[in-house]
């Protein structure tokens, strides 16, 4: 293509000078001799003519072949399609054309979208044709195969586009270029019709891909970095098929200096150091192909960034407790940069930071360092400390922000009993929450074991964790490598940066939480009365296990007792318990014997079943009510007794049996089932009854006897009986006995409200007692009957009965209440009896 003019990615000038009559002034293109015929068969040569003395008698009949003006060479070549047989009427001012020629500026490029090749033809200012309406056509061809084509494509192979000359003195020619042909050579020439004359450019050749003019860079933005530089960044325009270089220019406009500077880079960001406070920075960027020819894009729209009068860098710091951090500051005050030696620092405008913490970085940069920081205490809505850089005693209202967070987050893990997964838990309750922060568990797994001191590795993986209802986050590792060390930590991500909690390393094998022991059973052993607990150990882990048992009386709130079993082979244990007849709840858990791992959950509770383990310890205490005429020999006697308590019945009573003994009828028994009342006819002089308690094992051995004897019912040993009301819930009963030859076993106290038909209440008390406190609900205005029965081995003696309270000494007794309580004759035995009897009384 030695006949085509290669277009450079620059503006070039098309010059059309009037023809000279003398060949000697012609400047031929390389390879063309004077007599070379052109493609149309005419001996014409397209040259730039410098002579200006020619007269244009035939100007209107000429097509001017123009040249590209270049400082280095004056190269002209012909365009393939010459227009023949057309006559043009020229109206151009020939004298001006003779002096100056006709000149056009041409600039071509491929648009950034890589679809349109564009040429602008612009009439130069002193062009004699500039006042004429132009018609511009661009003829072009994209040869299919370059190697096989002739030197110049044949006439008629060119396509023609009409150029848009709507803009005065500027025409736009658009050539569509298929994407597949961007690397091909485009041949073209221009035909400009102006003032009735046709000007034709030489043949031009261009590879569109080498003429790309990208769109301007996008998204220009600026920010001050943490080290005090101005970061300028942008995005490359879309659809550019190759890397770009960028020219960045900025103007710095402050009250102290105005400067313009530029730099060419290949990245899409750069740093401007030495930025000024109180200054505005106007930045523009343009792009151009990095590694080959191309055209600079237009400049991006200007972007302005204004710095404050005080620049802090970094403006905000997020750090953890115990760390050291530094702030820098540049201060401009009243159009002067403040010397760093004159800068002082304050915290929250309340506390001057000691000068020992300052550093002069340069003439204008001051630095303050905080050591071993404590957690920031929130002040109202502010979760940071405000750090002020001040000009001696004058502080600007702007400040830097210091956020100090305690990042000690405890991560606890456990491996499940099947050894298939490890669950880790952590809570943020201990750390101050910071708006805009997110927390993430990160971990790194080593091939084997944990290192002595866990450290945060730069390469780590995040783990998904989910917030539970208890406020803890839970993360599950599955599958797991039992002997791998999992180093993990919590990363607090925040726009200000990220903080890591101290790392912890976990070996799944050493945090196994076994499955709880299975087949847990609990029973009270018969005749021995021990609580026997048995279990089966879980399948995993295979290590030796220790066990822990907890047991307690079943109920709403179980008061657990603990028992440890260290023998790994143990499968059962027997424990003494105070109450054989209670239902015991029992649970077992296990843990590795070597101290590693966690306790399993407690097994499901096992419960003892209450079963009789011995015959009842004794029969029930009982009393009687005698109905009928006291004068009659036959009387109905109703026996009353209180149901046996579990610790007496060991552990239950199925039924009660009454044993009778009389002199006439001998001995017989009556089964009364589980009733607590029984009536029989007393007909003989003496009738002894015994109440036995029967459980599944047998009958009670120790039993109470009561003999009903006519002669004994007349034996009167109770000389006097007095009742003293202490208050509405307590009455003191005291008595005096006369000597007797009969063996006194105990007393029965009986009382009832005479104003009601209520049942009789009774208590059995020790024979050694002379006074007794009856605890009941006594209504002061009601009448009560109190009876004291002496019970002898031989039978029930005559009772002493009173129907009213003693009047004389009531006051005295009330005053002596405190004294009476502490008297020695109300010692331990009586107190025990009264508590016991009160217990019985309440059950009555």
């Amino acid at each position: 293509f030695n006949l085509s003019y290669p277009i450079t990615p620059w503006r070039f000038k098309l010059s059309c000078m009037p023809p000279n009559s003398t060949y000697d002034y012609f400047l031929l293109p390389a390879g063309l001799s004077k007599n070379t015929s052109n493609l149309n068969g005419h001996y014409e040569t397209a040259v730039e003519f410098n002579s200006s003395d020619t007269h244009f008698s035939n100007l209107s009949k000429t097509t001017f072949h123009c040249c590209f003006r270049s400082e280095q060479d004056r190269n002209c070549s012909l365009c393939a399609d010459n227009i023949e047989g057309k006559t043009f009427v020229s109206t151009v001012n020939s004298s001006v054309f003779q002096q100056m020629g006709a000149n056009w500026n041409i600039q071509c490029w491929l648009k950034g979208d890589l679809k349109l090749f564009i040429c602008y033809v612009e009439s130069l200012f002193k062009n004699p044709f500039k006042n004429y309406k132009h018609k511009v056509h661009l003829l072009y061809v994209l040869p299919e195969v370059l190697e096989d084509s002739p030197l110049v494509p044949q006439k008629g192979s060119f396509q023609m586009v009409h150029c848009n000359c709507s803009v005065h003195e500027r025409c736009e020619c658009l050539v569509p270029v298929p994407t597949a042909k961007l690397n091909d050579t485009l041949l073209m020439c221009l035909k400009i019709t102006s003032g009735g004359v046709i000007f034709q450019s030489p043949l031009m050749s261009v590879q569109p891909i080498n003429m790309v003019k990208p769109d301007p860079p996008l998204g220009l933005r600026m920010e001050i970095t943490d080290d005090g530089n101005l970061k300028i960044s942008w995005s490359s325009p879309p659809l550019v098929p190759f890397p770009l270089q960028y020219e960045v220019k900025y103007s710095e406009n402050s009250t102290t200096v105005i400067r313009e500077a530029d730099k060419i880079v290949s990245a899409t960001s750069l740093l401007v150091d030495g930025i000024l406070p109180g200054s505005s920075y106007e930045v523009q960027v343009r792009g151009k192909r990095l590694d080959g020819p191309g055209i600079w894009s237009d400049w991006s729209t200007p972007h302005v960034f204004t710095t404050q009068d005080v620049i802090y860098f970094p403006p905000k710091i997020l750090t953890s407790v115990g760390s050291n951090v530094s702030f820098h500051c540049i201060y401009k005050n009243e159009n002067k940069i403040v010397s760093s030696k004159k800068i002082v620092w304050w915290m929250n405008l309340a506390e001057k930071i000691p000068q020992s913490q300052y550093d002069v970085v340069s003439d204008h940069v001051s630095k303050v360092t905080f050591f071993n920081l404590n957690e920031t205490k929130p002040r109202g809505k502010f979760t940071y400390d405000a750090v002020y850089c001040c000009n001696e005693h004058e502080c600007h209202h702007r400040y830097a922000e210091l956020y100090v967070i305690d990042v000690n987050i405890n991560i606890s893990c456990e491996t499940d009993g099947h050894l298939t997964k490890m669950t880790c838990r952590w809570s943020t309750n201990t750390i101050q929450s910071l708006a805009g922060s997110t927390l993430q568990l990160r971990y790194r797994r080593s091939s084997l074991y944990c290192f002595d001191i866990p450290s945060i590795h730069p390469i780590s993986k995040p783990k998904d964790c989910y917030l539970q209802s208890d406020g803890f986050y839970e993360c599950v590792f599955q599958p797991i490598f039992l002997l791998s060390g999992y180093t993990m930590w919590i990363r607090i991500n925040h726009p200000l940066g990220s903080l890591d909690s101290p790392p912890t390393c976990v070996l799944p094998d050493s945090v196994v939480k076994p499955l709880p022991p299975s087949s847990v059973k609990a029973e009270i052993i018969k005749n021995i009365g021990l609580l026997k607990i048995s279990w089966e150990k879980p399948v995993f882990p295979e290590n030796n296990l220790q066990f822990q048992i907890r047991y307690g009386l079943s109920g709403k709130e179980i008061q657990w007792k603990m028992y440890d079993v260290y023998d790994a082979k143990s499968k059962s244990v027997s424990l003494p318990v105070p109450d054989f007849c209670a239902v015991y709840a029992v649970q077992v858990r296990c843990k590795r014997s070597d101290g590693l791992g966690l306790w399993s959950n407690w097994s499901n509770p096992a419960y003892t079943v209450v079963m009789d383990i011995k015959v009842p310890m004794r029969g029930p205490e009982f009393w009687r009510i005698i109905n009928g005429d006291t004068m009659k020999k036959e009387k109905n006697v109703t026996l009353l007794w209180k149901p046996l308590m579990k610790n007496d019945s060991l552990c239950s009573v199925q039924r009660y049996v009454i044993n009778h003994h009389t002199s006439c009828n001998g001995t017989w028994s009556e089964d009364v089932g589980n009733h607590t009342k029984f009536t029989f006819l007393w007909t003989e002089q003496a009738h002894t009854v015994t109440v036995l308690a029967i459980n599944s094992i047998g009958a009670s051995v120790a039993n109470f006897n009561l003999t009903f004897s006519w002669p004994m019912s007349k034996v009167n040993i109770v000389q006097s009986l007095s009742a003293y009301p202490l208050n509405s819930s307590c009455v003191i009963l005291s008595w005096i006995l006369s000597p007797s030859d009969y063996k006194l076993m105990y007393f029965i106290i009986e009382w009832k409200n005479l104003n009601e038909d209520g049942e009789i209440k009774w208590l059995r008390i020790s024979s050694s007692v002379k006074k007794y406190y009856i605890h009941d609900h006594f209504i002061p205005i009601e009448k009560y009957q109190f009876s004291l029965y002496p019970i002898f081995m031989e039978g029930v003696g005559k009772p002493k009965i009173i129907n009213s309270f003693a009047q004389d000494n009531t006051e005295k007794h009330q005053n002596d209440e405190q004294k009476l309580i502490s008297e020695e004759d109300l010692g331990g035995e009586q107190k025990l009896i009264s508590e016991e009897d009160l217990h019985h009384h309440h059950h009555h």
């Epitope: 009250t255 102290t256 200096v257 030495g274 003439d363």
Partner: antibody, heavy 118, light 108 residues
Framework: QVQLQQWGAGLFKPSETLSLTCDVY????????WSWIRQPPGKGLEWIGE???????NYNPSLKSRVIISIDTSKNQFSLKMSSVTAADTAVYYC????????????WGQGTLVTVSS | EIVLTQSPGTLSLSPGERATLSCRAS???????LAWYQQKPGQAPRLLIY???SRATGIPDRFSGSGSGTDFTLTISRLEPEDFAVYYC?????????FGQGTKVEIK
């Protein structure tokens, strides 16, 4: 204390490329612009251009086509290259630090006399 | 570019006298962007005044600057023997930064 020490050849033939380097000692290299200024014998001062630590340049338009100022932050030095020198470029060349925040020159090198002669 | 013209070209004064040096700009220069330098033979210039009136570090208070717009003045209230030198004004409000041709203060 900031010190600027400049070095480079003092004699050039016309059309050659002048090359000077300025080493910076003491103080901060970062955060400043660094400049070249020349003074023809018995005449006034002419500002050639400046470069920032981050590599931004700002040149006197009258010399821009022939001048390249570069910076080597690892060595705390910056350099001047001026191509196609002529006798009119004979001068004492100074390197200087541009005062932070201003367009003034607060620290200067000792100066290098550059003579262009055939 | 902004052309700075200094006058007089030479100022002959005795020690102890007051020196007034003038600098005129071809177009307005904000007072924030004008500086003065002192240069002694065989030495590099030394910054005296920046921002038209602010003294540089270590400059004695006998040196003072004033002016605005296109007219600026450097005043040395009492000339000391070490003050005899060439003084240059410089503007840095418009690129390229330019210097005046200098005023020589010599001993009378």
């Amino acid at each position: 204390q900031v010190q600027l020490q400049q070095w480079g050849a003092g004699l050039f033939k016309p059309s050659e490329t002048l090359s000077l380097t300025c080493d910076v000692y003491g103080g901060s290299f970062r955060g400043y612009y660094w400049s070249w200024i020349r003074q023809p014998p018995g005449k006034g001062l002419e500002w050639i251009g400046e470069i920032s630590y981050s590599g931004f340049t700002n040149y006197n338009p009258s010399l821009k086509s022939r001048v390249i100022i570069s910076i080597d932050t690892s060595k705390n030095q910056f350099s001047l290259k001026m191509s196609s020198v002529t006798a009119a470029d004979t001068a004492v060349y100074y390197c200087a630090r541009v005062t932070y925040g201003y367009g003034t020159f607060d620290y200067w090198g000792q100066g290098t006399l550059v003579t262009v002669s055939s | 570019e902004i052309v700075l013209t200094q006058s007089p070209g030479t100022l002959s004064l005795s020690p102890g006298e007051r020196a007034t040096l003038s600098c005129r700009a071809s177009q307005s220069v904000s007072s924030s962007y004008l500086a003065w330098y002192q240069q002694k033979p065989g030495q590099a210039p030394r910054l005296l005044i920046y921002g038209a009136s602010s003294r540089a570090t270590g400059i004695p208070d006998r040196f003072s600057g004033s002016g605005s717009g296109t007219d600026f003045t450097l005043t040395i209230s009492r000339l000391e023997p070490e003050d005899f030198a060439v003084y240059y004004c410089q503007q840095y409000g418009s690129s390229p930064w330019t210097f005046g041709q200098g005023t020589k203060v010599e001993i009378k």
